[in-house]
């Protein structure tokens, strides 16, 4: 898919890794309390 | 003409939190990301983090971690940082900046006096 | 974190003349797509920080050609030649090839 304007900003470039990890991170931390919430619920 | 218009000095007391504003204008909002800086009384300048206004997407000055939050309202054109906890080493100038496609800080605010004191 | 240190703390200089500001970095700030996101900015007096040059040596626009930038690793220069009142105020320079981005102390230009 096309790069969204943002793309063009120096930042994005500096920053796509570390903020890439970040999101993975969030997502992780998502999925953990989502788990636990399936495991309190499914008591 | 790009702006980003500040809101006007906050004068809070030890562990309250504050909450302040950047206003963009003259350029597209989502298009580039918004950084915030500070500057303590006759001091050098911080960089504090960095947020996305297309998707939220934030990354923080591991010293500003638990410190700043930053959030935005698309609709309004508007990043906001939110303080908490604070104490005189709070004390500053608080900036928004914008960079382009070849430099980090191109435009800045007028910055956000902040000043701590029971 | 990458330290920029500025040499000298304070630059007494006389209307007209050439000033020289000094930025070293702790380490080298070549970042690994291979540019050096080295930049430089002018703090007046009761204003916010302005941006003069991005990437070591080119100027952001209606930044006036008297303002030039060099160096190259850890070592850079900022020359400002036939310094105007206009130039007078707190010069930082400032590294993005490394997180956090750091920036120097700065160097207060001032009349002598």
């Known amino acids: 898919s096309e790069e969204p304007p943002i793309s063009l900003d120096l930042t994005f470039h500096l920053l796509r890794e570390v903020l890439e990890m970040a999101r993975a991170e969030q997502l992780a931390q998502q999925a953990h309390s989502n788990r636990k919430l399936m495991e309190i619920i499914g008591k | 003409e790009v702006q980003l218009q500040q809101s006007g000095p906050e004068l809070v007391k030890p562990g309250a939190s504050v909450k302040m504003s950047c206003k963009a204008s003259?350029?597209?909002?989502?298009?580039?990301?918004m950084k915030w800086v500070k500057q303590s009384h006759g001091e050098s300048l911080e960089w504090i983090g960095v947020?996305?206004?297309?998707?939220?997407?934030?990354f923080y000055n591991q010293k500003f971690k638990g410190k700043a939050t930053l959030t935005v309202d698309k609709s309004s054109s508007t990043a906001f940082m939110q303080l908490n906890s604070l104490t005189s080493e709070d004390s500053a100038v608080y900036s928004c900046?914008?960079?382009?496609?070849?430099?980090?800080?191109?435009?800045w605010g007028q910055g956000t006096l902040v000043a701590v004191s029971a | 974190d990458v330290l920029m240190t500025q040499t000298p703390l304070s630059l007494p200089v006389s209307l007209g003349d050439q000033a020289s500001i000094s930025c070293r970095s702790g380490?080298?700030?070549?970042?690994?797509?291979?540019?050096?996101?080295l930049e430089w900015y002018l703090q007046r007096p009761g204003q916010s920080p302005r941006l003069l040059i991005y990437?070591?040596?080119n100027r952001f626009s209606g930044v006036p050609d008297r303002f030039s930038g060099s160096g190259s690793g850890t070592d850079f220069t900022l020359k400002i030649s036939r310094v105007g009142a206009e130039d007078l105020g707190i010069y930082y320079c400032?590294?993005?090839?490394?997180?956090?981005?750091?920036f120097g102390g700065g160097t207060k230009l001032e009349v002598k």
């Open positions: 900046a914008r960079g382009t496609d070849r430099a980090l800080f191109a435009y």
């Open positions: 380490q080298s700030i070549v970042h690994s797509d291979g540019n050096t996101y």
């Open positions: 947020i996305n206004p297309n998707n939220g997407d934030i």
């Open positions: 003259g350029y597209t909002f989502t298009d580039y990301f």
């Open positions: 400032f590294q993005g090839s490394h997180i956090p981005w750091t």
């Open positions: 990437k070591v040596s």
